[in-house]
Amino acid sequence: AGVFELQIHSFGPGPGPGAPRSPCSARLPCRLFFRVCLKPGLSEEAAESPCALGAALSARGPVYTEQPGAPAPDLPLPDGLLQVPFRDAWPGTFSFIIETWREELGDQIGGPAWSLLARVAGRRRLAAGGPWARDIQRAGAWELRFSYRARCEPPAVGTACTRLCRPRSAPSRCGPGLRPCAPLEDECEAPLVCRAGCSPEHGFCEQPGECRCLEGWTGPLCTVPVSTSSCLSPRGPSSATTGCLVPGPGPCDGNPCANGGSCSETPRSFECTCPRGFYGLRCEVSGVTCADGPCFNGGLCVGGADPDSAYICHCPPGFQGSNCEKRVDRCSLQPCRNGGLCLDLGHALRCRCRAGFAGPRCEHDLDDCAGRACANGGTCVEGGGAHRCSCALGFGGRDCRERADPCAARPCAHGGRCYAHFSGLVCACAPGYMGARCEFPVHPDGASALPAAPPGLRPGDPQRYL
């Protein structure tokens, strides 16, 4: 079970010359309402035939009065969706009729008068649970824009609303042979109830109440092996092992009919009965037109009504193929640059950028240092999507705002004592060592491994090298 939902976006004059006159006037104000009728399959039944899938009527729209001399604009619409509940499986292919009705609100005796303003019809393929499909239909000089979808009502799920979901009995997993119900991962698929008596070994069902046979079995309950029915074959020599007639080669062997055509023998050869949209001796010629509703996933059909005419489907984001039948993994093309994370949201593609990058595809490398000041005379250094400050002597931290303790790293070697100084640090070297960091030993004879200390400084005195 589920609901077919129809959203009317606009009803107004179509493009091109010959705009229709407004259906309402100052003398006869009116309001619109819509009726939708659904039938299963790609039927071409008359508009009057029953709406086997269901029908719905919208609320009345706002009252509209034409402005004299103005062209007919898009007319005000009723609020909300038209909803058509369906009790059984969603058929996947369906026919629709959408009627636009005018309710005249003049001073008619006996209440308002209704008249049919426009009727559009079409045949479409649609999977339940899919995205909203958008459509544009013309009726004379009028144009109707609308969206539609089919959704399952819990506990039903799946493209036909035939799989059932039940809350899990055990917290961790589903029972044997039963899958979790995506997207309701906390629920489990319930087993289908097939036709009573359907062979559990040789039969199965995809919809409640049916019994479909595995290969090699036949009969209403799949209890009859096919080998016994081959004894009834009218052709071929008798087989000594089974006592059955083994069919000889016939013109339909291997089914010469393409595209799902069914083959029947004729006195001289064979004949293919082609499915809708195909023709030719072997059903090899596609005569699909937009009237056959060939577009999936909300694709919009473009093409002529003539069987020779080409057609194609204008696909919504996330789908491709002549019939929009293929879902695109758009992230597999790695559209996000500079290590950005790709997110396919269905209706759009988003890139989540790493720090330091921006743009729809993370293609812009931000100037890491732009607007980033390093304090106290530090200079900004760019790199890898982040900024770093190279700080002046005596300062540290991310932005050089912290006064550094130059002695924290114990820079004076060989037991030298460190003194912080406004311009850096000073090392007072232990006896026998010299240099800015007390790194050089003084030779015992008084000679140094480096040039002697500047005049006026004895080895062991604090030395300051600026």
């Epitope: 493009p15 919009l300 489907c313 204008h314 789908f319």
Partner: nanobody, 114 residues
Framework: QVTLRESGGGLVQAGGSLRLSCGAS????????VGWYRQAPGKQRVLVAV???????NYAHSVKGRFTISRDNAKNTVYLQMNSLKPEDTAVYYC?????????WGQGTLVTVK
Amino acid sequence: QVTLRESGGGLVQAGGSLRLSCGASEITLSDKTVGWYRQAPGKQRVLVAVISNVDSTNYAHSVKGRFTISRDNAKNTVYLQMNSLKPEDTAVYYCYARDFEAEYWGQGTLVTVK
């Protein structure tokens, strides 16, 4: 109102070739489904070649193998390469583009095959 500009039509001998071009200045064709319809005198318009917004192509049975539709996004132009032309290809060829919001037509270009 946006119109598409067709060019490349003309008179050609049977068996010859022509290349039609369809350009637009106010709209981008790369994200549209673009096709070529033709209309012979006294007949209805038939879509002979079409390229979708996701670059799938399709052709009318009568031109399959002879006509090729392609697009050049940099030039915002769609082409119809017509080879092995036959007298029955004589028609006015119209460029057509559409997306979910709107549709656009050209004025048409005449192709005559003698």
